[in-house]
Interface confidence: medium
C-alpha cells in the first residue's frame, strides 16, 4: 500500500501551478475567480534514500495519469510530465526518475530530484514561465514551496 495525500503547491511568491497544454506546468499568480485552475498533486510517499530531513515522494497530478519526472535532455537534467499506466501507478517502488526528496525547512518545502542530486523543482521570478529543474547556483530562481492540503 502506498500512502498518498492531495495538495496544492505555491512558490515563494505565491504563484500557483497550472497545467498548460497537456504536458507542461506553468507558474503564475491567480486571482480568486480562477484559483480552481491550480493543479492538485497526489503526493505519494515512496521508497528511496530516507533521512529525517529528506522524505522521498512522487508527485502525480490528481485525476490524470501524469507524474513529474526527471530525465536527461540535451545533456541537462530536465523536468517533464510523464504519462503512466494508471493500473500500475502509484507504487511504493517508483522508478528513480519519479522520486523527489521532499525537504522541509520551517513551513517551506523543497523538492530535490533523487535522480539528479542538488537539482530542484524550480519556478522563475517571471510570470507564466514553465516549472523546471534548476540547480539554484546563485540565480534568482525559486525552489521553496508552500503546501495546502486538499480533501481527498
Amino acid at each position: 500500500a502506498v500512502r498518498s495525500l492531495h495538495c496544492r503547491l505555491q512558490d515563494a511568491q505565491q504563484k500557483s501551478l497550472v497545467l498548460s497544454g497537456t504536458y507542461e506546468l506553468k507558474a503564475l499568480h491567480l486571482n480568486a475567480e480562477n484559483l480552481n485552475q491550480q493543479v492538485v498533486f497526489s503526493m505519494s510517499f515512496v521508497q528511496g534514500e530516507e533521512s529525517n530531513d529528506k522524505i522521498p515522494v512522487a508527485l502525480g497530478l490528481r485525476g490524470k495519469n501524469l507524474y513529474l519526472s526527471c530525465v536527461m535532455k540535451d545533456d541537462k537534467p530536465t523536468l517533464q510530465l510523464e504519462s503512466v499506466d494508471p493500473n500500475r501507478y502509484p507504487k511504493k517502488k517508483m522508478e528513480k526518475r519519479f522520486v523527489f526528496n521532499k525537504i522541509e525547512i520551517k513551513d517551506k518545502l523543497e523538492f530535490e530530484s533523487a535522480q539528479f542530486p542538488n537539482w530542484y523543482i524550480s519556478t522563475s521570478q517571471t510570470e507564466y514561465m514553465p516549472v523546471f529543474l534548476g540547480n539554484n547556483s546563485g540565480g534568482q530562481d525559486l525552489i521553496d514551496f508552500s503546501m495546502e492540503f486538499v480533501s481527498s
Epitope: 500512502r3 495525500l5 510517499f45 521508497q47 529525517n52 521532499k102 492540503f149
Partner: antibody
Framework: QVQLVQSGAEVKKPGASVKVSCKVS????????IEWVRQAPGKGLEWIGE????????NYNEKFKGKATITADTSTDTAYMELSSLRSEDTAVYYC?????????????WGQGTLVTVSA | DIKMTQSPSSMYASLGERVTITCKAS??????LSWFQQKPGKSPKTLIY???RLVDGVPSRFSGSASGQDYSLTISSLQYEDMGIYYC?????????FGGGTKLEIK
C-alpha cells in the same frame, strides 16, 4: 519539543459513549498522521486507526469500524477518538501517537494514555 | 491481516549480555517495521522505525536489522533500564499490526 497530552481516565456504564482527546504541541499538527492504539489490561497493543488532520483523511482497522470515530480540530491542535456502545471488553488504555518524521516512517511520539473503564 | 509473530514471548538475560528479539511477518512488509519498548504503567517508547533508524535519544546499543521477512532488534550490551516489554509493528498495510510482545527481564 513534541508533546501529546491526553484527557484523563474515564469510568463509563455499558452502552455509554466516551470521547478521548489528544492535544498536540511542538510541531505542525496538520501535517502528520495521528494514530490511536489500545491496550487491554495485561494484553498487547492493537491499532485502531489514524487521521491526517490537514485534510481529514482517516483509515480505520475494520475491527473498530462502528466502534471508534476519529476526528481532529486543527484550530486547537487536538485529535479525538469517540468510542460508542461501550462494553466491558472495551476497558483498556487508549493511546494516541504521531508519525512525526513523515507519513510512512513510524509512530514516533506517544501520549501518556487514557484509561477507559467500562463497568456496570 | 498481516500477522507478526514475535519471539521469544519472554526471556531472562544478564547485564552486559547481547540480546536479540525477532519478529516474522506473514507476508512482505517492505521494511515498514518499528520497535517499541514499554515499561509497566507507561506509554510505549519508540526505539526504531523503518527497520533500523534510531529515534533521537535512543542509545546506540539498540539496533535493528532485517533478513527477508525476519526482523530483529538487538541490544548489544544489556543494561538494567532495558527491562520491559518489546513490541514490533508493521505499518506497510492496513490494519497495522503489532507483534505479541517480548517480556525481557534481568537474570
Amino acid at each position: 519539543q513534541v508533546q501529546l497530552v491526553q484527557s484523563g481516565a474515564e469510568v463509563k456504564k455499558p452502552g455509554a459513549s466516551v470521547k478521548v482527546s489528544c492535544k498536540v504541541s511542538g510541531y505542525t499538527f496538520s501535517r502528520y498522521w495521528i494514530e490511536w492504539v489500545r491496550q487491554a489490561p495485561g494484553k498487547g497493543l492493537e491499532w485502531i486507526g489514524e487521521i491526517l488532520p490537514g485534510n481529514g483523511n482517516i483509515n480505520y482497522n475494520e475491527k473498530f469500524k462502528g466502534k471508534a470515530t476519529i476526528t481532529a480540530d486543527t484550530s486547537t491542535d487536538t485529535a479525538y477518538m469517540e468510542l460508542s456502545s461501550l462494553r466491558s471488553e472495551d476497558t483498556a488504555v487508549y493511546y494516541c501517537s504521531t508519525i512525526y518524521y513523515d507519513y510512512d516512517q513510524g509512530f514516533t511520539y506517544w501520549g501518556q494514555g487514557t484509561l477507559v473503564t467500562v463497568s456496570a | 491481516d498481516i500477522k507478526m509473530t514475535q519471539s521469544p514471548s519472554s526471556m531472562y538475560a544478564s547485564l552486559g549480555e547481547r540480546v536479540t528479539i525477532t519478529c516474522k511477518a506473514s507476508q512482505d512488509i517492505d521494511r515498514y517495521l518499528s520497535w517499541f519498548q514499554q515499561k509497566p504503567g507507561k506509554s510505549p517508547k519508540t526505539l526504531i522505525y523503518r527497520v533500523k533508524r534510531l529515534v533521537d535519544g535512543v542509545p546506540s546499543r539498540f539496533s535493528g536489522s532485517a533478513s527477508g521477512q525476519d526482523y530483529s532488534l538487538t541490544i548489544s550490551s544489556l543494561q538494567y533500564e532495558d527491562m520491559g516489554i518489546y513490541y514490533c509493528l508493521q505499518y506497510d498495510e492496513f490494519p497495522y499490526t503489532f507483534g505479541g510482545g517480548t517480556k525481557l527481564e534481568i537474570k
